[in-house]
Amino acid sequence: KVILDKYYFLCGQPLHFIPRKQLCDGELDCPLGEDEEHCVKSFPEGPAVAVRLSKDRSTLQVLDSATGNWFSACFDNFTEALAETACRQMGYSSKPTFRAVEIGPDQDLDVVEITENSQELRMRNSSGPCLSGSLVSLHCLACGKSLKTPRVVGVEEASVDSWPWQVSIQYDKQHVCGGSILDPHWVLTAAHCFRKHTDVFNWKVRAGSDKLGSFPSLAVAKIIIIEFNPMYPKDNDIALMKLQFPLTFSGTVRPICLPFFDEELTPATPLWIIGWGFTKQNGGKMSDILLQASVQVIDSTRCNADDAYQGEVTEKMMCAGIPEGGVDTCQGDSGGPLMYQSDQWHVVGIVSWGYGCGGPSTPGVYTKVSAYLNWIYNVWKAEL
């Protein structure tokens, strides 16, 4: 039976086996098409999620759908139930925490009192002044905290204590891509990781170790990508993997935070990359040990120059590396996080693509996660 399961798939009506390699190949090999059912699925970008969190102390903002304007949430009469509703609107199922933070001098949005209507936050109609003088600072999930802070050096071996959200995404027990834990059910990675193998069955996630192959594998229930854009085929390089069973968090298994919607990182901002990928462009071999490196944001204009990517880097991507080259992600690092540390660690980018590895004019190109927050929230909500 083990051999049969490994190499064959059972079609129903009539019962017969087909080679497993015909699963999710885009061709209907079973009479009822069930060989194309448990495959990578695409999910549209969907409607705007009407709540968001700002980098200004994780303050809650609410959309007035009638006008398209955003408002900051006043702390007056804000309750745990409203906090849960806000987080549910973003697809979180965990218990949130919230607190009052003073309205700052740079507050540029109108501040309104919040209420709830059919499981969505709304602005209170007769909203007077914000008497508390405070905004709502909301955290939907405890995230982005590690046991150990990395040292700022070029490239060195990494410890899972520093990066407890890093996972290895494997097909048939072979490491293919990196990924990041976002919550107990969800792992963030790159869509292109699943281009060659689109059957969900053979994909596994390994979490909790910095060594390849030394930790138990977790079954995957779903792999979700965004609809492919024919004009910009390198855009939308983002995927969410739903685990069959929720993770139990520990010192070595923890989630990283999503970025804030307004997380604009200026050129030269320090960032971190990690992965088990090739250590040389033509090295032809994955690293057995997790490696980490410090890099920095590279200006998109520079990245799109004639001697670099010639306009191929879109607004939904970002470049990172070091100006002189030599420190970069490479084959096998795809899907892993590009990370920024403020109070917590945030996954601001996903290792996506590049020409070669480590070239001075062609740094790594990363999916800009803040451009896809709406999509992530919509996927999570649909799967709640």
Epitope: G26, P44, K196, F228, Q310, S334, S352, W353, Y355, C357
Partner: antibody, heavy 126, light 107 residues
């Protein structure tokens, strides 16, 4: 067997309309972006329009923009091209094609049209 | 938009010959180039993608080379079924434009 079958071509007067259909079979139609390509008599190939798998993205050649509309019905495994305000220069064989994007080194994509229909002829003449 | 220019526009050769068709892009397209074969009254068929990669089911006598702006399709030993028109297509940026074609005839 993977197949695309176009229909709907014919003779139409300048300024008239036609709707081309392309029926897909043997593959998961809803997973693929699709395109229309045309070939005028004795001429080369010209890309006309493309549509993404769930219709979120639609693109057109400048020569047909505003006159042609691409659409698809994934429940019927069918691609369409609605052609309005037809001109003599739209006379061609129209092919539908399946778009593939295969993964290269380090996340780079390579594009091609790997499955084509047999074509349907559109003649615009008075 | 990127323009693609093929040469020659037609050529005559015999069975067993080695044949080379070239394609030039108006700007650099890295290796984002496809080659198609089309026989009279038939739909085009994808032969080579990414400049050098053979599409599955295509005989190994077909090969592609080049990068940047200059590309070549080579047929190492012509077979009777290879007489057709060949098109290059850039797949670097929309719209994905085709060359004007090269007609390969029996000498």
């Amino acid at each position: 067997e993977v197949q695309l079958l176009e229909s709907g071509g014919g003779l139409v007067q300048p300024g008239g309309s036609l709707r081309l259909s392309c029926a897909a079979s043997g593959f998961t139609f809803s997973s693929y972006a699709m395109s229309w390509v045309r070939q005028a008599p004795g001429k080369g190939l010209e890309w006309v329009s493309s549509i993404s798998s769930a219709s979120s993205y639609k693109y057109y050649a400048d020569s047909v923009k505003g006159r042609f509309t691409i659409s698809r019905d994934n429940s019927k495994n069918t691609l369409y091209l609605q052609m309005n305000s037809l001109r003599a220069e739209d006379t061609a064989v129209y092919y539908c094609a399946r778009d593939i994007y295969s993964s290269g080194w380090r996340g780079y994509y390579y594009y091609g049209m790997d499955v084509w229909g047999q074509g349907t002829t559109v003649t615009v003449s008075s | 938009d990127i323009q693609m220019t093929q040469s020659p526009s037609s050529l005559s050769a015999s069975v067993g010959d080695r044949v080379t068709i070239t394609c030039r892009a108006s700007q650099g397209i890295r290796n984002d180039l496809n080659w198609y074969q089309q026989k009279p009254g038939k739909a085009p068929k994808l032969l080579i993608y990414a400049a050098t990669r053979l599409q599955s089911g295509v005989p190994s006598r077909f090969s592609g080379s080049g990068s940047g702006t200059d590309f070549t399709l080579t047929i190492s030993s012509l077979q009777p079924e290879d007489f057709a028109t060949y098109y290059c297509q850039q797949a670097h940026s929309f719209p994905y434009s085709f060359g004007q074609g090269t007609r390969l005839e029996i000498k």
